[in-house]
């Protein structure tokens, strides 16, 4: 669709005569008829196939024609067409004398014709005017012409319809050739696909408007390049969605089981060495001079009562020192200078001479001890607490503080590790000397039967188009991570590709 435009500029008829040579009375009141038609090697009468237009009376005899287009007038003359411009044409311009006001062809005498010109040739679509001048023996006509496309039509033949738009069916303007020029932020054949945020992951992200990055299921982050770990994952990470790969020292399905209590909590005090001995279980090996489950108690070297025969013990920086009572000497006051004659046995102890009276021995009554029966019996000296239990004097009695995993009066009973029901998913627990063992039912594995192995939703390869399948352990379902160009819960649908359907 386009318009052939003809701009009449000047008509010269100095003698004011008709084509017949007869003069006009009082002068030639001139109007024009224009016929536009298909190309003819010899322009002949016949239908004006591309259109026709007439002017009102524009002047008398010789006159210049005013450009009247800005005022909505008839110059340039418009000959619209609703077809592809063929690039060639024939043009007939007739100048007529109007004796009266009726300009219809049937109202004019045939000899009212002043002049007739006919041209033909090639004409490309464009903004530039072609200037032409046709002269006969009596008249001269100067004019120019061009072909331009109608609004929204483009191309060499005005055959390409293009309307700029900015809605969800396209965001574009039209180029001179009718091709689309996408507005910033849009791409695709019809400029309806937004250009996502720079760096937005091609497979894991998408967008509905420019500079946006929306994440597909299982992905997060500004650029959708961070996987979302399994729901409830505590101390773990993922490299693909819904994983829960435990950090060092953590275990279990959700990495919430502490396998490295020593590192995470540092329970051992005073420079003691910590050893992990199971989930949330540990053992502290104390440095010399310290005791307690966590080596939190400072141990006085006099606490073991090393001084014999009533010697008193004094703590020193590098050990201890025994102050011996009269008649005794030695590091621990173990050597005596006394005999039974000196009545060395206290608390009712009976004295027995040894080595021909050079030495003696006291036989102590119950509840007393020591070489001179000078000490009340310390019920802890016999180390009655088994399995590393700590003995504590409580007046006339004693008690044992047991290490984790042991119980009983003397810590002689091994606490069943199975009492806590540590085996998940119905696993059977077996107590062992150094811990426990779980026998897992079908479909589960791991130290505590915490790992599902049987129901693998991905086993049936449900994902299409080389998508990656992930099993969601919490729901026994699968999630397909689609490669670029595919969508759908199984990645079964191509994106943006010409569909292979017969419509």
């Amino acid at each position: 669709s386009g318009v052939f435009q003809l701009q009449l500029q000047e008509f010269i008829n100095e003698r004011g005569v008709l084509a017949s040579g007869r003069p006009c009375e009082p002068g030639c009141r001139t109007f024009f008829r224009v016929c536009l038609k298909h190309f003819q090697a010899v322009v002949s009468p016949g239908p004006c196939t591309f259109g026709t237009v007439s002017t009102p009376v524009l002047g008398t005899n010789s006159f210049a024609v005013r450009d009247d287009s800005s005022g909505g007038g008839r110059n340039p003359l418009q000959l619209p067409f609703n077809f592809t411009w063929p690039g060639t044409f024939s043009l007939i311009i007739e100048a007529w004398h109007a004796p009266g006001d009726d300009l219809r062809p049937e109202a004019l005498p045939p000899d009212a014709l002043i002049s007739k010109i006919a041209i033909q040739g090639s004409l490309a679509v464009g903004q530039n005017w072609l200037l032409d001048e046709q002269t006969s023996t009596l008249t001269r006509l100067r004019y120019s012409y061009r072909v331009i496309c109608s609004d929204n039509y483009y191309g060499d033949n005005c055959s390409r319809l293009c309307k700029k738009r900015n809605d969800h069916f396209g965001h574009y303007v039209c180029q001179p050739d009718g091709n689309l020029s996408c507005l910033p932020g849009w791409t695709g054949e019809y400029c309806q696909q937004p250009i996502c945020l720079s760096g937005c992951h091609e497979q894991n992200g998408y967008c509905s408007k420019p500079a946006e990055c929306l994440c597909r299921p299982g992905w997060q982050g500004r650029l959708c390049n961070e996987c979302i770990p399994h729901n409830g994952c505590r101390h773990g990470t993922c490299s693909t969605p819904w994983q829960c790969t435990c950090d060092e020292g953590w275990g279990g399905l959700f990495c919430d089981q502490d396998l490295n209590y020593c590192t995470h909590h540092s329970p051992c005090k005073n420079g003691a060495t910590c050893s992990n001995s199971g989930q949330r279980s540990y053992t502290c090996t104390c440095r010399p001079g310290y005791t307690g489950v966590d080596c939190e108690l400072e141990l006085s070297e006099c606490d073991s009562n090393p001084c014999r025969n009533g010697g008193s013990c004094k703590d020193q920086e590098d050990g201890y020192h025994c102050l011996c009572p009269p008649g005794y000497y030695g590091l621990h006051c173990e050597h005596s200078t006394l005999s039974c004659a000196d009545s060395p046995c206290f608390n009712g102890g009976s004295c027995r001479e040894r080595n021909q009276g050079a030495n003696y021995a006291c036989e102590c009554p119950p509840n007393f001890t020591g070489s001179n029966c000078e000490k009340k019996v310390d019920r802890c000296t016999s180390n009655p607490c088994a399995n590393g239990g700590q003995c504590l004097n409580r007046g006339p009695s004693r008690m044992c503080r047991c290490r984790p995993g042991f119980t009983g009066t003397y810590c002689e009973l091994h606490v069943s590790d199975c009492a806590r029901n540590p085996c998940a998913h119905g696993g059977t627990c077996h107590d062992l000397e150094n811990g426990l063992m779980c026998t897992c039912p079908a479909g589960f594995s791991g130290r505590r039967c915490e790992v599902r192995t049987s129901i693998d939703a991905c086993a049936s390869s449900p994902c299409f188009n080389r998508a990656t399948c992930y099993t969601d352990l919490s729901t026994d379902t699968f999630v397909c991570n689609c490669p670029y160009g595919f969508v759908g819960s199984r990645c079964e649908f191509p994106v943006g590709l010409p569909p292979s359907f017969p419509w």
């Epitope: 609004d151 929204n152 319809l161 309307k163 700029k164 738009r165 809605d167 969800h168 069916f169 396209g170 695709g188 054949e189 019809y190 309806q192 696909q193 998408y206 967008c207 509905s208 408007k209 929306l214 969508v487 759908g488 649908f493 191509p494 994106v495 943006g496 569909p499 359907f501 419509w503």
Partner: antibody, heavy 121, light 104 residues
Framework: EVQLQESGPGLVKPSETLSLTCTVS??????????WGWIRQPPGKGLEWIGD???????YYNPSLKSRVTISVDTSKNQFSLKLSSVTAADTAVYYC??????FGGGADSWGQGTLVTVSS | SYELTQPPSVSVSPGQTASITCSGD??????VSWYQQKPGQSPVLVIY???TRPSGIPERFSGSNSGDTATLTISGTQPMDEADYYC?????????FGSGTKVT
């Protein structure tokens, strides 16, 4: 050839929510070449565009209905749905789902057969 | 809101030409689609992008659009063409239908 089929209750009480689903067969709802729309026609009256949706979930609504309309898409089921809340007798109409082609300048080249929804107590 | 106006009815004799107009502000700068709807049936797209016929639509259907008016022309009208005809255009992000014209 692509086919569209509307489904949902034919009778809805005033003030309740109208819910319809359109199932697409013979073609993928995930094609980048189409939007999927809802159009309605009250008995004896003309067509009224309700809104449409792209496979990514982008939605566009008639401004006069926007506050009451929700359109959603389920690419795994090849379906899209319409919800119209707080309905009145004026919402009684035949509801059509249609495919709007980007390459046709938005012209709807395929339509469902339509389903009559009556709003009445 | 944007409005498209159509004459309520157009009568035509078989074999003659029927012209249905659709007017709206600056309509010539928008793409217009035309739909045919027969009683009890779903609409059918007969013209898109002002003047393009989808495959399967007879050549007697043609369209044009300039200024503020789009026109659907049915040349050599047949009895089977008796139906309601709706024009449609897009204004911003919203679809707009004309009021419909009954061709008898």
């Amino acid at each position: 050839e692509v086919q569209l089929q509307e489904s949902g209750p034919g009778l809805v009480k005033p003030s309740e929510t109208l819910s319809l689903t359109c199932t697409v067969s013979g073609g993928s709802i995930s094609s980048s070449n189409y939007y999927w729309g809802w159009i309605r026609q009250p008995p004896g009256k003309g067509l009224e565009w309700i809104g449409d949706i792209y496979y990514t979930g982008s939605t566009y609504y008639n401004p006069s209905l926007k506050s009451r309309v929700t359109i959603s898409v389920d690419t795994s089921k090849n379906q899209f749905s319409l919800k119209l809340s707080s309905v009145t007798a004026a919402d009684t109409a035949v509801y059509y789902c249609a495919r709007e082609a980007v390459s046709f300048g938005g012209g709807a080249d395929s339509w469902g057969q339509g389903t009559l929804v009556t709003v009445s107590s | 809101s944007y409005e498209l106006t159509q004459p309520p009815s157009v009568s035509v004799s078989p074999g003659q030409t029927a012209s249905i107009t659709c007017s709206g502000d600056g309509l010539g700068d928008k793409y217009v689609s035309w739909y045919q709807q027969k009683p009890g049936q779903s609409p059918v797209l007969v013209i898109y992008e002002d003047s393009t016929r989808p495959s399967g639509i007879p050549e007697r259907f043609s369209g044009s659009n300039s200024g503020d008016t789009a026109t659907l022309t049915i040349s050599g009208t047949q009895p089977m063409d008796e139906a309601d005809y709706y024009c449609q255009a897009w204004d911003s992000e919203s679809g707009v239908f004309g009021s419909g014209t009954k061709v008898t």
